[in-house]
Amino acid sequence: GITNINCSGHIWVEPATIFKMGMNISIYCQAAIKNCQPRKLHFYKNGIKERFQITRINKTTARLWYKNFLEPHASMYCTAECPKHFQETLICGKDISSGYPPDIPDEVTCVIYEYSGNMTCTWNAGKLTYIDTKYVVHVKSLETEEEQQYLTSSYINISTDSLQGGKKYLVWVQAANALGMEESKQLQIHLDDIVIPSAAVISRAETINATVPKTIIYWDSQTTIEKVSCEMRYKATTNQTWNVKEFDTNFTYVQQSEFYLEPNIKYVFQVRCQETGKRYWQPWSSLFFHKTPETVPQVTSKAFQHDTWNSGLTVASISTGHLTSDNRGDIG
């Protein structure tokens, strides 16, 4: 970068090299060139010579002033016009950055995705800081009082093997950058309460010719959790509003869910599950599209994703559920 050049003097920024976006800043350049009394001192930002707001402070120093500086990053350098030199002489350069102090991290969430072997903690970092911001995740056992800290720049995966202090923990997040530091509220967790079942996946759909044609959606999960509650949402692709069916599910076999749908319409389906009575849901599964036939013939749709299932599938049973209307997004 610009900071690696050989300097014949120095360049500095007030109030600092990293500063709050929108501030007024001054960039100073001081020449120190053997037998060169600079006739002029020039400033360049990202290679372009600045023309205004330059003040000569003294024989070897000049100041460039910026009002309301809004660029997240800029490379600055300055040069001197030395007598009897046809080219400007490079004095020094510096990379400058502007941004914001971190917001207080909120919505701290820790979940264990089944089979992952990790506890994944995420949070809402707030507004973009534009500058390097680090997060320290504190995990404190409520049983042993032992505290562990994990440094990251976004979310964190903590191996469940490293959580040796029992089942109950406090988790909080500290955000820090050059402009400030903030700390989240503490989240109390129990490891047994934060497990999210293995992803539920829609594998296929078929519309069966009957007096009233019905569509059967086939879906499954690899979970070993016994009590699982699921939601399936669906809508015509032309609609805004989702319809939601709720199920209490036992994944010892492939699930079949029946829907009575309008003919000759393209529908989209998604499913998600949680351990019954627990807090966190899976994210909604991938979109599964199925177009109902105009008339009699049987239509089968296959999922876009092809998963390999470990269990041999022989018996299929029908599960039905309660139908609701849903405007919710994808928040667990």
Epitope: A32, Q37, R39, K59, C82, P83
Partner: antibody, heavy 117, light 107 residues
Framework: QVQLVQSGAEVKKPGASVKVSCKVS????????IHWVRQAPGKGLEWMGG????????LYAQNFQDRLTLTEDTSTETACMELNSLRSDDTAVYYC??????????WGQGTLVTVSS | DIQMTQSPSSVSASVGDRVTITCRAS??????LAWYQQKPGKAPKVLIY???SLQSGVPSRFSGSGSGTDFTLTISSLQPEDFATYYC?????????FGQGTKVEIK
């Protein structure tokens, strides 16, 4: 083009002080490094002191360290040389000169200072 | 301090002659050497800077050479207006110092 115009000739008694001015035009004082050089009658050139841009400081020759003061007034674009405790061997022509990449490209016209009782 | 020794201290020459003046520094001054011409009652005038660079406006009969400790000013063909005193000056380190001067006189 730099022009350096010095104040007029002075006659001083031994022990007195003299102040010679050097008015700059064409450039500002902040864009120039002003040095002072003197020449005793029939003798060579002697560097007295001046601004060193590499270290941003005013330097003085050892012989003059205790009694020479170099100042600048950017509001009037005037450099001054004050020499105290004058002796008869301080009789000389005093020049201000603008340093330009290791040489003096621009000189004042010179100021004759005569020290005599 | 760096001592600058010029030789000869004076030289008698005729118009059209080639004149060479040398200047020796008591220690290495790289190429930080200038040559001046001074006429009676006038301020010196720079001829050569950084040992060999000709100052703008100076006739090309003047040339400079050398580096380190030994330097030369050459006037290839002496003209009537060249009769004057010549000084070398080092600018490698402070205090800057001058040679004692070489007077070029009419033979």
């Amino acid at each position: 083009q730099v022009q350096l115009v010095q104040s007029g000739a002075e006659v001083k008694k031994p022990g007195a002080s003299v102040k010679v001015s050097c008015k700059v035009s064409g450039y500002t004082l902040n864009e120039l490094s002003i040095h002072w050089v003197r020449q005793a009658p029939g003798k060579g050139l002697e560097w007295m002191g001046g601004f060193d841009p590499e270290h941003s400081e005013t330097l003085y020759a050892q012989n003059f360290q205790d009694r020479l003061t170099l100042t600048e007034d950017t509001s009037t674009e005037t450099a001054c040389m004050e020499l105290n405790s004058l002796r008869s061997d301080d009789t000389a022509v005093y020049y201000c000169a603008a340093e330009s990449y290791g040489d003096y490209e621009f000189w004042g016209q010179g100021t004759l200072v005569t020290v005599s009782s | 301090d760096i001592q600058m020794t010029q030789s000869p201290s004076s030289v008698s020459a005729s118009v059209g002659d080639r004149v060479t003046i040398t200047c020796r520094a008591s220690q290495d001054i790289s190429s930080w050497l200038a040559w001046y011409q001074q006429k009676p009652g006038k301020a010196p005038k720079v001829l050569i800077y950084t040992a060999s660079s000709l100052q703008s406006g100076v006739p090309s009969r003047f040339s400079g050479s050398g580096s380190g400790t030994d330097f030369t000013l050459t006037i290839s063909s002496l003209q009537p207006e060249d009769f004057a005193t010549y000084y070398c000056q080092q600018a490698n380190s402070h205090p800057w110092t001058f040679g004692q001067g070489t007077k070029v006189e009419i033979k």
